[in-house]
């Protein structure tokens, strides 16, 4: 049997903010899965604190109930059942409350 190896990084990760201060996180599959299983993981950190840790079959996450005036780091990676891949990282910061005129 062929030994598995770490998958490559997910790519084209996007973080889109909606008007209710939730986030829609998507990414494309890694070019090299190198293993038998497919699982996407999303970690959300506020400062150095992990505030979300989700796992989906597809790289499509809705992250709700985020706090205003907080800096968040989004880390998405692929796990092939044996190894995690390198995370794709994006940062988001919000300093002002959303008002209707901004929508």
């Amino acid at each position: 049997t062929t030994k598995s190896a770490p998958p490559s990084q997910v790519w084209n990760m996007t973080v889109s903010m909606t008007s209710d201060n939730s986030m829609h996180v998507k990414c494309r599959p890694p070019r090299d899965r190198n293993g038998p299983h497919e699982r996407y993981h999303l970690e959300v950190e506020a400062g150095n604190t992990l505030v979300r840790n989700e796992s989906h079959k597809n790289c499509d996450f809705r992250v709700k109930d985020l706090q205003y005036s907080t800096d968040y780091t989004f880390k998405a990676y692929f796990h092939n059942g044996d190894y995690p891949g390198e995370p794709f990282i994006l940062h988001h910061s919000e300093q002002k409350l959303i008002s209707e005129e901004d929508l």
Partner: nanobody, 126 residues
């Protein structure tokens, strides 16, 4: 029809600073906006995004803490302050404005942008 024009690119030494600007004309400046870049032989990649009032920003991990996106709505201008640049920052930098139909407040997704500038070349020498 919104038109975007980038300015401020050029050749700089590693460790230096550079400020890119993007002038918008021909339409309203009321969309979220972003900067993307494309290095030779590589795919276009997200750099930074900013919402309509400047209160929300997003950055790629590779530029976080070095680059700052801002906007002046009175001047219809978007900015990218680039500090501590490295040769890996060498690329053509594109300014982009959201498409009207986007449901988002900010986005790192190029598909959510409907208007693009022609780009400005930034070359960082070591």
């Amino acid at each position: 029809q919104v038109q975007l024009q980038e300015f401020g690119g050029g050749l700089v030494q590693a460790g230096a600073s550079l400020r890119l600007s993007c002038a918008a004309s021909g339409g309203t400046f009321s969309y979220f906006m972003g900067w993307f870049r494309q290095a030779p032989g590589k795919e276009r990649e997200f750099v930074a995004t900013i919402n309509r009032n400047g209160g929300a920003t997003g950055y790629a991990d590779s530029v976080k803490g070095r680059f700052t996106i801002s906007r002046d709505n009175a001047k219809n201008t978007l900015y990218l302050q680039m500090d501590s640049v490295t040769p890996e920052d060498t690329a053509v930098y594109y300014c982009a404005a959201a498409r009207e139909s986007s449901v988002y407040y900010t986005s790192t997704d190029p598909a959510e942008y409907g208007y693009w500038g022609q780009g400005t070349q930034v070359t960082v020498s070591s």
